[in-house]
């Protein structure tokens, strides 16, 4: 039994890191393998992650971690019984994929303005709380070409757009994702989408 693709890990910079790897043949990850991990820290202890299958030869492990700080470094040991298959390390701050924003809501009762709000996925004491920026994707269910992205580069988790920038009388969906420039993170997954019916009063034409 050998590792074909070494484990690569990504952290949510809060409490979970996800490691994926591939074996050289079909493997029952949960019964045959164990990923041991430990924070390099005086007060830490070793933890064991039981991997799940991710395709025939692929394995994935979800590591529960202490709250992350930038200096953290974890040792990783992949075992098959008594055999050490791979040994490595992982710095969560260097491989961050933020959590997806939540609670996306479209407020349509503000005088021909659409107000989209969502929740920051981090608690205020987390470093990323004040460092996330967002991308909002709005698209029409009726017209695949009517697809737009709004970059929200300020900290407030909200976006205002004029209802008139979208077509009236049809349904739209929106979703939002996040990233943090400070740690050069990847984008988060998209939030669940929310749907609304766009309608606004057309201004009277002046003759």
């Amino acid at each position: 039994m050998k590792v074909l693709q070494e484990p690569t890990c990504v952290s949510d910079y809060m409490s979970i890191s996800t490691c994926e790897w591939k074996m050289n043949g079909p493997t029952n990850c949960s019964t045959e393998l164990r990923l041991l991990y430990q924070l390099v820290f005086l007060l830490s202890e070793a933890h064991t992650c039981i991997p799940e299958n991710n395709g025939g030869a692929g394995c994935v492990c979800h590591l529960l971690m202490d709250d992350v700080v930038s200096a953290d470094n974890y040792t990783l040991d992949l075992w098959a019984g008594q055999q050490l298959l791979w040994k490595g390390s992982f710095k969560p701050s260097e491989h961050v994929k933020p959590r997806a924003p939540g609670n996306l809501t479209v407020h349509t009762n503000v005088s021909d303005t659409l107000l989209l709000t969502w929740s920051n996925p981090y608690p205020p004491d987390n470093y990323l709380y004040n460092h996330l920026t967002y991308a909002v994707n709005i698209w029409s269910e009726n017209d695949p070409a009517d697809f737009r992205i709004y970059n929200v580069t300020y900290l407030e988790p909200s976006l205002r757009i004029a209802a008139s920038t979208l077509k009236s009388g049809i349904s739209y969906r929106a979703r939002v994702r996040a990233w943090a420039q400070c740690y050069n993170t990847t984008w988060s997954e998209w939030s669940p989408s929310t749907k609304w019916h766009n309608s606004y009063r057309e201004p009277f034409e002046q003759h």
Epitope: F41, L42, L43, D66, D67, S70, A71, P123, P124
Partner: antibody, heavy 115, light 109 residues
Amino acid sequence: EVQLVESGGGLVQPGGSLRLSCAASGFTFSRNAMFWVRQAPGKGLEWVSGIGTGGATSYADSVKGRFTISRDNAKNSLYLQMNSLRAEDMAVYYCARGRYYFPWWGQGTLVTVSS
Amino acid sequence: EIVLTQSPGTLSLSPGERATLSCRASQSVSSSYLAWYQQKPGQAPRLLIYGASSRATGIPDRFSGSGSGTDFTLTISRLEPEDFAVYYCQQYDHSAGWTFGQGTKVEIK
């Protein structure tokens, strides 16, 4: 908002015992190492003890064998049991949250050791 | 045990002046594990700098940290009235644990 509130300080005679508590709120207590740092009157800061998320502990040489740190994750609380207290243990005791350094501190509780 | 020695013990300066505080370690310290704190009378310490040079949340940019190995520096570019306080450096070591310097008092001249 992160809050750390110490209690349990007071006047104790040399050789006596005292138990300090720290009530934590505003963060996930169970995922954080916690510490006690003290400051004698007019003196500098001294790290006393720390406890990891899994219960691993460490102590300064000056308190080893006399002080015991513990935590109750269900109660979001940190404790310091201090036995065989000496005059040199007299200080303000701070509860702190952190790891390699301490971003969050309580306001401290004063322990006075005097006969 | 790693010993941190801060100098000078007291620094007498006027508002608007530049303050340079030194912290010397008895053996090499990882920059990732070197921090600076400010403490005012009757208050808990406040983290200013971590990782030798990163400012903590909410700390003004007049505070900066530098250094590596055994020599570290905290610089306050222009002293404001609220900056007069005692400053401590602190290190963490995987075997020796946590130690603080004895402090530098920055007082009004």
